[in-house]
């Protein structure tokens, strides 16, 4: 780094709020799409190039001029697995976090022309190619259709779809947000013969209603109504079906075969939480009780003689938790061996750490193939010889991520493939494997600038650097950048990790204001080795504020003892631990304990508000963006996972004593900025409205900002700039900065 240890002698510019808002310094990605075991697509200057992984040579797959006459702005593209067609997406209209509608056209790569007959309708909700060949499944008006050939008519699979009532092949609001993290509820079998799908019924689910003000010319605001089950309310019901796409015909309705949930699920409310094809004719389904400490995996086989699916009770696998809930957020997905007779799955071991267990479909017990006081984050690939996984084992740092391979014939033979590649620069990796895992792209995202490299699985040798962000590195040499410290403190004989974004030329003998950046939701992690250019970068670089984050009880990837500590008790230990962290930080000698602030968004807004309302005396001020204020206002799937039901027999007492509103009186001791989008479909404006009302009722003076028609992300260009400018002013005023 240029410059000197002396801040006054460093003439370089700082990273400003404008730099953040205008994205002056852009991290370069290298987003590839594998199309085979040795080729990938990469977009360069709007040309789509196809690269040979082994040799690195490329050719133009599709010129940027191909669609000059198309007449629409293409939002995304998707190439059929056989490489014959390209699906073009346009007229994109966002719905919720993952869902959107769009228009689609199909381009025939052999004929070099758009297919004009039998087009997919406008406002399609989801489209997906079959895993091989070029069949298409799509959802329109909540019903599923299949195209055997892009130019042939669609076969209608379902006839029951109804807006906000019956969803075929797509998720309703709560399944999208909290279960599948996707709009799609369609699953092709590996060779594209079968199409499995879920059907959600929201008939009895209560509606959240909010105003959408839209253009100034709209005299009466629109009312948005969304089926949204809040904690304890009526939930959607789910059914699961499989259709054989070889059976489809225009002159008879498609026959979908239902696979019912296990008897142990049908006794009460339950969720479908995972669908994984094991083989061409074997499918695994995971079901979860509404009280999310008990799940069942069914393994179902196609019976050709009857055309039905049989799920043997002897093949059911039960997963349960006695200390909390199943999975990090839901039960993990199984990774089946080629024959479909066994699978690997991440589950909690006896010590409460999440590791890989090997299951045989006909046996109840499994064999753990990894162990230790660390956790496996994800299984990334499975071949006949090796299983590849990401874990945070290396150097005992929960906030790190590295790629490992384990030999399936000898579980003691484990190799870290990324640990020693670039240990200073790269401690946080993700990976993208080619179709049969012959090659892989490593994506290093910190602590140094992101680095993308390509590797061969044959000998795990690095083939080439794809992107090293050297141009950005050169630019940042001329900027006074903050440094990042990642360390831990010990509380009650337990390590708790924190990170600090430290101002340039940090001097531990000086006193700095500190902003605690909090999330603190169950299984969260804010202390990590990732490089980021964000609001904190500006605050540290330009305003000389330390921005710290702390992973206390409830946080993830460090075992269930820590994560399940807040089971049935949201708003307790995770809140107390943020206050304790701030106390510990102020004892470190370089924090001005009269200038400590806290801020957070969503769950972080809830924790911020609970902290500020605790009367601890530690914090001068804070900002809560889109906070939860009372758990009965939030959705059933997320809330009940951790809190159970808001009934007297279950956990109503804690629902009622974990509200922000009950702490209103204590806000007289702090400066509070409350922010919310009026069109937040996720954490409803209601939640902040109730905080505001409670504060007004006890005479608390506070600051507030609403963002008209903004959702949970407050992400429109103007609103994004406004909120961060507004929060910057608030923090500077709180810290008495010029």
């Amino acid at each position: 780094n240029k410059g000197t240890d002396d801040a006054t002698a460093d003439s370089r510019k700082t990273y400003t709020l404008t730099d953040y808002l205008k994205n002056t310094y852009r991290l370069k990605l290298y987003s590839l799409r594998w199309i085979s075991d040795h080729e990938y697509l990469y977009k360069q200057e709007n040309n789509i190039l196809v690269f040979n992984a082994e040799y690195g040579n490329s050719s133009v797959f599709l010129e940027n001029s191909t669609f000059d006459e198309f007449g629409h702005s293409i939002n995304d593209y998707s190439i059929s697995p056989d490489g014959q067609f390209i699906l073009l997406e346009y007229n994109y209209v966002k719905q919720w976090r993952h869902s959107y509608t769009a228009s689609y056209d199909i381009y025939d790569l052999n004929k070099r022309q758009l297919i004009t007959e039998e087009r997919i309708p406008n406002n399609t909700q989801w489209v997906t190619w079959s895993p091989v060949g070029h069949k298409l499944a799509y959802v329109w008006n909540n019903d599923i259709y299949v195209k055997i050939e892009p130019n042939l008519p669609s076969y209608r699979i379902t006839w029951t779809g109804k807006e906000d009532i019956i969803y075929n092949g797509i998720t309703d609001w709560v399944y999208e947000e909290e279960v599948f993290s996707a709009y799609s509820a369609l699953w092709w079998s590996p060779n594209g013969t079968f199409l499995a799908y879920a059907q959600f019924n929201d008939t009895e689910v209560p509606l959240i209603e909010y105003s959408f003000y839209s253009d100034e010319s709209l005299q009466y605001p629109k009312t948005v109504r969304v089926p949204y089950p809040k904690a304890g309310a009526v939930n959607p019901t789910v059914k699961f079906f499989v259709v054989n796409t070889d059976s489809l015909s225009s002159v008879t309705n498609a026959t979908s075969i239902q696979i019912t949930a296990p008897a142990s699920m049908l006794i009460g409310d339950h969720y479908l939480c995972d669908v994984t094809w094991a083989t061409q004719e074997r499918i695994s389904l995971q079901w979860l009780r509404r009280i999310q400490n008990y799940s069942v995996m069914d393994i179902c086989d196609y019976d050709e003689s009857s055309g039905r699916w049989n799920c043997l009770v002897a093949r059911q696998h039960i997963e349960m938790s006695t200390t909390g809930w199943v999975g990090r957020f839901r039960p993990s997905e199984p990774h089946f061996t080629l024959d479909g007779n066994s699978f690997y799955k991440i589950i909690s071991n006896e010590e409460g750490y999440r590791h890989i267990c090997y299951f045989q479909i006909d046996k109840k017990d499994c064999t753990f193939i990894t162990k230790g006081t660390w956790e496996v984050i994800g299984i990334e690939a499975l071949t006949s010889d090796y299983l590849y996984y990401i874990s945070n084992e290396y150097k005992g740092m929960p906030g790190g991520r590295n790629l490992y391979k384990i030999q399936l014939s000898d579980y003691t033979k484990v190799t870290c493939l990324s640990c020693e590649l670039n240990p200073e620069r790269c401690q946080y990796y993700s990976v993208s494997f080619s179709k049969e895992a012959k090659y892989y792209q490593l994506r290093c995202s910190g602590p140094g600038l992101p680095l993308y490299t390509l590797h061969s699985s044959v000998n795990d040798k690095g083939l080439r650097v794809l992107e090293d962000n050297s141009a950005l590195d050169k630019m940042l040499q001329n900027v006074q950048m903050p440094s990042k410290k990642l360390d831990f403190i010990i509380l009650n004989e337990t390590k708790f990790w924190y990170q600090m974004i430290l101002p340039p030329h940090f001097d531990k003998s000086k006193k700095y204001p500190l902003l605690l950046d909090v999330y603190a939701g169950p299984c969260s992690q804010k202390a990590d080795t990732v490089f980021r250019l964000n609001w904190a970068t500006y605050l540290a670089s330009t305003e000389n504020i330390i921005v710290a984050s702390f992973d206390g009880r409830g946080s993830g990837y460090q075992g269930d003892k820590i994560m399940h500590a807040i089971n049935r008790r949201l708003g307790t230990f995770e809140v107390e631990d943020q206050i304790e962290a701030a106390r510990q930080f102020s004892k470190m000698g370089f924090v001005d304990n009269k200038r400590i602030a806290i801020w957070g968004w969503s769950y972080g807004g809830y924790v911020t508000s609970m902290v500020l309302g605790s009367g601890s005396g530690v914090f001068k001020c804070g900002i809560a963006v889109a906070p939860v204020s009372r758990w009965e206002y939030y959705d059933s799937v997320y809330t009940e996972r951790y809190m159970g039901l808001p009934t007297p027999e279950d956990n109503l007492d804690h629902y009622r004593n974990s509200t922000v509103m009950s702490r209103a009186e204590n806000f007289k001791q702090v400066e509070y900025l409350l922010i919310h989008g009026t069109a937040d479909d996720n954490v409803h404006f209601q939640q902040s409205a109730q905080i505001s009302k409670a504060l007004v009722d006890v005479g608390v003076d506070f600051q507030a900002m609403w963002y008209t028609d903004e959702d949970h992300g407050i992400a429109s260009s103007t609103a994004h700039q406004h909120i961060y400018t507004h929060m910057s002013h608030f923090i500077k005023q709180c810290f008495s900065l010029p």
Partner: antibody
Framework: EVQLVQSGGGVKQPGETLRLTCTAS????????VHWVRQAPGKGLEWVGV???????DYDAAFMSRVTISKDTSKSTAYLQMNSLRAEDTAVYYC??????????WGQGTTVTVSS | DILMTQSPSSLSASPGDRVTISCRAS??????LNWYQQKPGQAPRLLIY???NLHSGVPDRFSGSGSGTDFTLTISRLEPEDFAAYYC?????????FGSGTKVEIK
């Protein structure tokens, strides 16, 4: 390899019952429908009916009262039964595999002659 | 029922000739039309499905076109083995119906 092998034709008396067999190999009768058509001497093709993969049946109205199409999936066999045969039922009868909206494989045909 | 009318009922042509056969539906059948070839003493075989799509293994001298009610089968250069009967068939609605056939004979 997909194949449809037919049997059961021959000479029938008027009023008798006809039972034709179509044995499939290389595919499953629970996946694909099997259609039956017939072709009178020197004439065109006439659709009789179908049994779908899930066992449902559809018939041409002209044959509804005296035709039954069935199958035994364990034997991979489809059947056409026609009652009350008359001279005009004399034809070559074909079974075919239904592939979406077309017939991609045909049986070799079986000749039925109704004569007193 | 949907009536399928084929024309001509027969035609004479020589090898190398271009031949077109028409098929008309009594109502709109979109593109749900198939063409079959039948040689004497044999079962019919699929040539074209869904108006214009060539079935696998069928020579590309065969082509189909049309939509709605009017359809055409074209043989661009007649080969000796193409002398046979040709049938159209609608697949949009039960009962399925066939055209009465066109016999292509050697001139």
């Amino acid at each position: 390899e997909v194949q449809l092998v037919q049997s059961g034709g021959g000479v029938k008396q008027p009023g008798e019952t006809l039972r034709l067999t179509c044995t499939a190999s290389g595919f499953s009768l629970t996946t694909y429908g099997v259609h039956w058509v017939r072709q009178a001497p020197g004439k065109g093709l006439e659709w009789v009916g179908v049994i779908w993969g899930d066992g449902r049946t559809d018939y041409d109205a002209a044959f509804m009262s005296r035709v039954t199409i069935s199958k035994d999936t364990s034997k991979s066999t489809a059947y056409l039964q026609m009652n009350s045969l008359r001279a005009e039922d004399t034809a070559v009868y074909y079974c075919m595999r239904n592939r979406h909206d077309w017939f991609d494989y045909w049986g070799q045909g079986t000749t039925v002659t109704v004569s007193s | 029922d949907i009536l399928m009318t084929q024309s001509p009922s027969s035609l004479s042509a020589s090898p190398g000739d271009r031949v077109t056969i028409s098929c008309r539906a009594s109502q709109d059948i979109r593109n749900n039309l198939n063409w079959y070839q039948q040689k004497p003493g044999q079962a019919p075989r699929l040539l074209i499905y869904y108006s214009s799509n060539l079935h696998s293994g069928v020579p590309d001298r065969f082509s189909g076109s049309g939509s709605g009610t009017d359809f055409t089968l074209t043989i661009s250069r007649l080969e000796p083995e193409d002398f046979a009967a040709y049938y159209c068939q609608q697949s949009i609605k039960l009962p399925l119906t066939f055209g009465s056939g066109t016999k292509v004979e050697i001139k």
